[in-house]
């Protein structure tokens, strides 16, 4: 059950796991949600009736019964973890806390013009968890405008005290706002030889990497596989850090894999949930419950529904089965990871999916796609929308992409002659245009935001945002696509697809079924040679075959150029313009989305 409301002047009695300091009850709830065992919490707000040393304490709690006795206490605010809540949970916290000094290890002190600049510095510093900034009104003249970057072992302050004329806040890495590069590759046969901050058991390097990403101090990791020669270290995931933020030494070692935290590329971050099921593997841990179920998937669902369950083992041993049902062992541990991993067993293991609604929905696995055909299948491009105009009659106008639960990214040139957002309708989860009837539900458009430097498609800035009147509930057939990370400007995308209901040749009509075409990216240098009469800027990106034959065309405008990188789909381009359609040596020209990430974030996150 998902309980979101906070209980004022209420304290949960007992069940304490640990105490951390948070600047607000809201943030205490987020910390509880991400903690492997926390189900409930009690936060103490500042109050004259309360001992100041207890102000801002956030006590994380657990209970076998999933609840605890309530006691009335002034200034106490209690609530439940967001584990199992179906709405999106995010660690992103943009709040600025006035007159609060969030204490931690100050590791960088420098002058900044504003609190915003200080927060940006923190967001772009690999070690920074939070900051404190002394404002222009700070009593000590010499400390005015000083920006202190801080970190701690837990990622939360070691203490929070009142202090006039300072402001504090958190790094916005988890809000997709970091400009740090993120390295998504996992390096085989590699050991990073730096200091270990923690170690856990993991079934593979991908799980190890996700654990590293969500661990506040982890910057990179080394994972020893099942074939690692030293038996005691098999399946060990070492979470590491270094002063420089990068590994100081890489050692070539067979059967080890290493990689980096993806904390700085949170808009394509792996969620803190591991959906894969591991056959022939036993996850050891504290026994929570044993139940008979039919099949490993039902076992995983059972674990997910039981809020305290962290991982499970489904046994196929004859003595553990009755007819079609077998034993499902529901387990937990202190850190959320198995305490041991055994191979060669008759059964399968996996993790609870209770935190799969955290992070960005854009990273959630999409159904396997059918490659080779030209018609798409349902759910293949769940971010693709069809934008209709109702004036003078209803028709498909342009494509677009869902990038947030209230936002569609499309091309500016689509709105030539569109006087008002009232005539627009956005349809999502559509495969065939014929599905759209009078009674088909759609999203009204509240606002059209066209880039203020846009003049015409060929001169660039061909980008627009549509703010929807209502929010999109994410499902398998409608969910967002990730924006590319600014740190990934140098990534060479090799798996790019253009989609839309546009013409299949220059003189044609809108297609009924959503079409797809795999198209290679072309360098801007090469593209410029093909369009000598135009200026191909770095804010444009080109794609097409030299011989032509596959391309976007009229009606595809505004739709996505989607590229898959490290199992995550990114919105690399917006269909913009081109000479004809699929002509030889005339690539399609797309708006280069990575160059507009700041603009998108500025517009979508404006208060």
């Amino acid at each position: 059950e998902c309980v979101t409301q906070l209980l004022k002047d209420t304290c949960f009695e007992g069940g304490d796991i640990t105490t951390v300091f948070t600047p607000s009850a809201k943030y205490c709830q987020v910390v509880c949600t991400y903690h492997p065992r926390c189900l409930l919490f009690t936060f103490t707000a500042e109050s004259p009736s309360e001992d100041p040393t207890r102000w801002f304490t956030c006590v994380l709690k657990d209970s076998v019964t999933e609840t605890l006795p309530r006691v009335n206490r002034t200034a106490a605010i209690s609530g439940y973890s967001f584990k199992q809540c179906s709405h999106q949970i995010s660690a992103c916290n943009k709040d600025i806390y006035v007159d609060l000094d969030m204490k931690g290890i100050n590791y960088n002190s420098s002058v900044a013009k504003s609190a915003q600049e200080c927060q940006e510095r923190c967001t772009d510093d690999v070690h920074c968890h939070f900051f404190t900034y002394a404002t222009r009104q700070f009593p000590s003249l010499e400390h005015r405008n000083i920006c202190l970057l801080k970190h701690t072992q837990t990622g939360t302050p070691t203490r929070i005290t009142k202090l006039d004329k300072v402001v504090s806040g958190f790094s916005l890495k988890s809000c997709a706002l970091s400009n740090l590069a993120c390295i998504r590759d996992i390096f085989p046969n590699t050991v990073f030889a730096d200091s270990n901050i923690d170690s856990v058991m993991a079934p593979d390097a991908f799980v190890c990497g996700r654990i590293c990403t969500h661990h506040p101090g982890c910057l990179f990791f080394t994972f020893f596989s099942q074939e690692w020669p030293k038996e005691s270290q098999r399946n060990l995931c070492l979470l590491k850090t270094s002063e420089s933020g990068l590994p100081s030494t890489r050692i070539k070692k067979s059967k080890a894999l290493s990689g980096f935290s993806l904390q700085s590329c949170r808009h394509s971050i792996p969620v803190p949930c591991h959906s894969k099921i591991y056959p022939g593997v036993d996850f050891g841990g504290e026994e929570l419950n044993v139940t008979f179920v039919k099949g490993v998937n039902v076992c995983q669902e059972t674990c997910t529904k039981m809020i305290r369950c962290q991982f499970f083992t489904y046994s196929l041993l004859p003595e553990d089965c009755k007819e079609e049902k077998c034993k499902c062992f529901l387990r937990l541990s202190m850190d959320g990871s198995p305490t041991r991993i055994a191979y060669g067993t008759q059964g399968s293991s996996g993790y609870s999916l209770r935190l799969c609604n955290t992070g960005d929905n854009c990273t959630t696995k999409i159904k396997p796609r059918i490659v080779g055909g030209t018609a798409s299948v349902r759910g293949e491009w769940p971010w693709q929308v069809t934008l209709h105009t109702t004036s003078p009659t209803q028709r498909h106008l342009c494509g677009g992409s869902i990038i947030g639960n209230q936002w569609i990214l499309t091309a500016a040139h689509c709105f030539y002659g569109v006087e008002s957002p009232k005539i627009l309708r956005v349809y999502s989860g559509i495969l065939n245009q014929s599905e759209i009837k009078e009674d088909t539900s759609f999203f009204g458009v509240q606002e059209i935001i066209i880039h203020d430097q846009y003049k015409m498609a060929e001169s660039g800035y061909d980008i627009a945002l549509l703010k929807l009147e209502t929010t999109v509930n994410y499902t398998d057939s409608q969910r967002p696509i990730c924006l590319p990370s600014k740190g990934d400007r140098n990534v060479i995308y090799t798996d790019c697809w253009v989609t839309g209901w546009g013409y299949r040749k220059l003189r044609d009509k809108i297609q009924n079924t959503l079409q797809k075409a795999k198209i290679p990216l072309v360098t801007n240098e090469e593209c410029q040679k093909r369009y000598r009469g135009h200026k191909i800027t770095h804010k444009m990106i080109c794609a097409g075959y030299r011989e032509g034959g596959k391309d976007a065309c009229k009606g595809d405008s505004g739709g996505p150029l989607s590229c898959k990188h490290n199992e995550v789909w990114h919105l690399v381009g917006i269909t913009s313009w081109g000479e004809g359609c699929a002509q030889r040596e005339r690539p399609g020209v797309y708006t280069n989305v990575v160059e507009y990430v700041d603009w998108i974030l500025e517009k979508t996150q404006a208060v």
């Epitope: 002190s109 002394a134 000590s140 003249l141 010499e142």
Partner: antibody
Framework: QVQLEESGPGLVAPSQSLSITCTVS????????IYWVRQPPGKGLEWLGM???????DYNSALKSRLSISKDNSKSQVFLKMNSLQTDDTARYYC??????????WGQGTTLTVSS | DIVMTQSHKFMSTSVGDRVSITCKAS??????VAWYQQKPGQSPKLLIY???YRNTGVPDRFTGSGSGTDFTFTISSVQAEDLAVYYC?????????FGGGTKLERL
């Protein structure tokens, strides 16, 4: 935990130079300023100078010409150098960590005697 | 440079008494004044910073007040372990400076 420890020569002859090292642990010198304060026997505290996290320095006006403060962030060490020592420079020398201009952690101090 | 003056070099008190130590700055230092306690043979210990903020672990019998040029440090109920020398320090502007100190002794 936070610790500061001063180490100095103990005895210096007049007109000679002084070099004292403050070795810190439990925090980073890039994030905190470090102060030098001295206390002559039976007297009060005198502020000598400081080095900020970003390397800037500030000195006591009366001693500015004789003082130099530097640091090595990687070794977690701060150095106080003072030349042309006189007998009235005899004192206990402390290093302390900055907290918004106040000094929240102090070393135990090192005693310097200027005598021939 | 800013000069900090503690008018009383010595103050006599008894256990349980309320005692106030004053400090005057030669120019406006806003609220950037700290107070330290020093016992014989020990390093100074920060009690109060920015006029009225108690350092971690400092008992609440120690308080500070004032602004501009006049500052007061108060012990609401003196304990035997409070007998020591107390210094004020301005941390408004470098070069920072200390007061001459006030020795709190048994009556």
């Amino acid at each position: 935990q936070v610790q500061l420890e001063e180490s100095g020569p103990g005895l210096v002859a007049p007109s000679q130079s002084l070099s004292i090292t403050c070795t810190v642990s439990g925090f980073s010198l890039t994030g905190y300023g470090i102060y030098w304060v001295r206390q002559p026997p039976g007297k009060g505290l005198e502020w000598l100078g400081m080095i900020w996290g970003d390397g800037r320095t500030d000195y006591n006006s009366a001693l500015k010409s004789r003082l130099s403060i530097s640091k090595d962030n990687s070794k977690s060490q701060v150095f106080l150098k003072m030349n042309s020592l006189q007998t009235d420079d005899t004192a206990r020398y402390y290093c302390a960590r900055d907290y918004y201009g106040s000094k929240d952690y102090w070393g135990q101090g090192t005693t310097l005697t200027v005598s021939s | 440079d800013i000069v900090m003056t503690q008018s009383h070099k010595f103050m006599s008190t008894s256990v349980g008494d309320r005692v106030s130590i004053t400090c005057k700055a030669s120019q406006d230092v806003s609220t950037a004044v700290a107070w330290y306690q020093q016992k014989p043979g020990q390093s100074p210990k920060l009690l109060i910073y920015l006029t009225s903020y108690r350092n971690t672990g400092v008992p609440d019998r120690f308080t500070g007040s004032g602004s501009g040029t006049d500052f007061t440090f108060t012990i609401s109920s003196v304990q035997a372990e409070d007998l020591a020398v107390y210094y004020c320090q301005q941390h408004y502007k470098t070069p920072y400076s200390f007061g001459g100190g006030t020795k709190l002794e048994r009556l």
